[in-house]
Amino acid sequence: DIQMTQSPSTLSASVGDRVTITCRASQSINTWLAWYQQKPGKAPKLLMYKASSLESGVPSRFIGSGSGTEFTLTISSLQPDDFATYYCQQYNSDSKMFGQGTKVEVKGTVAAPSVFIFPPSDEQLKSGTASVVCLLNNFYPREAKVQWKVDNALQSGNSQESVTEQDSKDSTYSLSSTLTLSKADYEKHKVYACEVTHQGLSSPVTKSFNRGEC
């Protein structure tokens, strides 16, 4: 299969900026490349086909170029409606592989997350499972790392993260990380902690609780 690699995965920009997204194919696809724009909850919209041909109705600020293995999509002057995720797709072969996407986000000022930790509810514990939630509120940029520690032992593979869309007012994100354990495992341990790192924080922030004391 032909692999498609897009970069960057996130692009921070302001209205009026000129932005360029790159797409590389693992082997030559001539000019059999399309670009799509997708907004949350909506179907992808075709912008460009055959690398540089503008789809009807698409503004001329979208410019496609390239051939062989290297392609670019340039937005000459970013407009408010252009904040979205962009995908390249090759259609030289049957697999019609997509790139992994580039999210064009509103460039905000750096904001460190406010961090909160929530133990499982008594109601949930009755069902035999325990979910501990670490909430990161109102941070920018989106890159943040959450590490779970149980009795100071690093946890891996038993947590899931969910990130909100960028807030339209202040350009921040919020994230929840959920550590899921069986009730039996939860009750074997005492100290539950989430450690958060983000570029707005000079040092990691740790929030914790002692089971049975909250």
Partner: nanobody
Framework: QVQLQESGGGLVQAGGSLRLSCAAS????????MAWFRQAPGKEREFVAS??????????????FYGDSAEGRFTISNDNARNTGYLQMNSLKPEDTAVYYC?????????????WGQGTQVTVSS
């Protein structure tokens, strides 16, 4: 390991300018992001600005970020050939008085500041 050394601090009048430098040595190829923080007496260390030094998968190298206090007045930049980061500070105010620290994250831990300089004092007089 990466070593960071700041320079360029000093005494300046309100409305004036200063350029801080941060010279990196050691495993500089492992730097992902370089940032400036500042700490005024009795206050917490505050983020000022950052620049992506070596692009990972997320942002292009050269992408810049600013804190509220710096936006519009300060400019962060770097010179990879010289392994040096810069913070150009214009329209300085007395409230910008602080010790300014250079910090860096690594490609392995791109959101954690594992490396810090010793700091350089900036004093803005009214």
């Amino acid at each position: 390991q990466v070593q960071l050394q700041e320079s360029g601090g000093g005494l300046v009048q309100a409305g004036g300018s200063l350029r801080l430098s941060c010279a990196a040595s050691g495993r500089t190829s492992s730097i992902h992001l370089m940032a400036w923080f500042r700490q005024a007496p009795g206050k917490e260390r505050e983020f000022v600005a950052s620049i992506i030094w070596t692009g990972g998968t997320t942002y292009y190298a050269g992408t810049t970020f600013y804190g509220d206090s710096a936006e519009g007045r300060f400019t962060i930049s770097n010179d990879n050939a010289r392994n040096t980061g810069y913070l150009q500070m214009n329209s300085l105010k007395p409230e910008d008085t602080a010790v300014y620290y250079c910090a860096a994250t690594s490609l392995e831990n791109p959101t954690r500041y594992d490396y810090w300089g010793q700091g350089t004092q900036v004093t803005v007089s009214s």
